[in-house]
Amino acid sequence: KFSKQSWGLENEALIVRCPRQGKPSYTVDWYYSQTNKSIPTQERNRVFASGQLLKFLPAAVADSGIYTCIVRSPTFNRTGYANVTIYKKQSDCNVPDYLMYSTVSGSEKNSKIYCPTIDLYNWTAPLEWFKNCQALQGSRYRAHKSFLVIDNVMTEDAGDYTCKFIHNENGANYSVTATRSFTVKDEQGFSLFPVIGAPAQNEIKEVEIGKNANLTCSACFGKGTQFLAAVLWQLNGTKITDFGEPRIQQEEGQNQSFSNGLACLDMVLRIADVKEEDLLLQYDCLALNLHGLRRHTVRLSRKNPIDHHS
């Protein structure tokens, strides 16, 4: 339940936050789950715990595994799990999918690319930025705080962007890199009142208890880049992120497609390990832009597994 995936490259720094919510200043104990061995807090160790953070300075492939964190209190301990994978550095330029953070979209009006996970590190500006492994040069590129700004964005600016920075720990420096894809939205076109293609209004979706289920909210908003357009899921009228059920997640980053020249977005709602109580929830697919908001409601019903009799 309280689990989070983290990944990094060997010989780079990796810092992981305990997925279980505590508050600053509380004691957090870390363990290597496979052996139940306590992670030391002394900073002279290559891997050490520092409050809510677990630090690999630097990381090694052998560090991969599940780490347990326990936020301690005399009356209520809270346990979380960090699933850490450390990969070998690639010799070629390609960044494999498993090392990629969520894709971001930009346009001429908004071309910020944030450096993922940087807030966990003790770093100083400026960041170094690379596109498809080439260092970015020229006045169009500006590294500002923890993000990259691209002036006069063009379609050719789409690609994989890597930020590189130095984490400092007690005077020692460690390199960190993080990569995410950037897509460019076309600026010309027009906008319409949102049209939801899926799901149908008041659709009943059959799901199997204990299995995973996906719901796709898909809507079109006009032609070309939309100044303001979004699709999202709500549960019982609450945003997914606020609802706080870890089994139910929206797919990070909205997929943009152009169907018959129309600008369309879809957002996939992933429900892991469907439970009885999920059938009682109201799932709303919301599509909104400057013209207004359209809502289609979906409910789940139990699909009875087909009996197999001899």
Partner: antibody, heavy 117, light 111 residues
Framework: DVQLQQSGPGLVKPSQSLSLTCTVT?????????WNWIRQFPGNKLEWMGY???????TYNPSLKSRFSITRDTSKNQFFLQLNSVTTEDTATYYC??????????WGQGTSVTVSS | DIVLTQSPASLAVSLGQRATISCRAS??????????MHWYQQKPGQPPKLLIY???NLESGVPARFSGSGSGTDFTLNINPMEEEDAATYYC?????????FGSGTKLEIK
């Protein structure tokens, strides 16, 4: 942000049961946290009554003996107080509150309950 | 149960001056390097609001003029400088063991 909205009767007769509802928005009560009931007597004294945690496990103040229980409805994201055999001593303002860890971080608006015939 | 005794019961402080409120526990609320004492502010008609947790940690969004200190059985809440909006009743609460208990409150007024 987590928000807690309380509802329930303002007047209860002695020996009857008091039932109050706390509806949570902005967070699922099954995700994490502990969900408390606290009451404040007319002299302003505060008393922690107990909590139900994200897993449904309950912890009660022994001073309330077996008169008190907390339950929940996860489909509505609500948790409930039930106090049986009330007396005039149970006249108070009742609050629901959430605990991230130890302290009461978010509070409901409070429900004033008078026990009187 | 751990009994928390607050003093004074009421206090009047001039704007810009320091207000000091004490909370004494009937037994230690500290263990493993932490003191499990928290402070709340309550204004008339409103629920209490968390100010400080673990004796000295400022809750997010609370002004820095509020500070807490102490360990074991003796704890202090300081407000410096006192501002008009700080007129309220202040409560301490422990979470060292069940049941959690609150102090009797200190009413802070402007002199």
């Amino acid at each position: 942000d987590v928000q807690l909205q309380q509802s329930g009767p303002g007047l209860v007769k002695p020996s009857q049961s008091l039932s109050l509802t706390c509806t949570v928005t902005g967070y699922s009560i099954t995700s994490d946290y502990a969900w408390n009931w606290i009451r404040q007597f007319p002299g302003n004294k505060l008393e922690w009554m107990g909590y139900i945690d994200y897993s449904g496990s309950t912890t009660y103040n022994p001073s309330l003996k077996s008169r008190f229980s907390i339950t929940r409805d996860t489909s509505k994201n609500q948790f409930f107080l039930q106090l049986n055999s009330v007396t005039t001593e149970d006249t108070a303002t009742y609050y629901c509150a959430s605990t991230v860890i130890d302290s009461m971080d978010y509070w409901g608006q409070g429900t004033s309950v008078t026990v009187s015939s | 149960d751990i009994v928390l005794t607050q003093s004074p019961a009421s206090l009047a402080v001039s704007l810009g001056q320091r207000a000091t409120i004490s909370c004494r526990a009937s037994k230690s609320v500290s263990t493993s390097g932490h003191s499990y004492m928290h402070w709340y502010q309550q204004k008339p008609g409103q629920p209490p609001k968390l100010l400080i947790y673990l004796a000295s940690n400022l809750e997010s969004g609370v002004p820095a003029r509020f500070s807490g200190s102490g360990s074991g059985t003796d704890f202090t809440l300081n407000i410096n400088p006192m501002e008009e909006e700080d007129a309220a009743t202040y409560y301490c609460q422990h979470s060292r063991e069940f049941p959690f208990t609150f102090g009797s409150g200190t009413k802070l007024e402007i002199k």
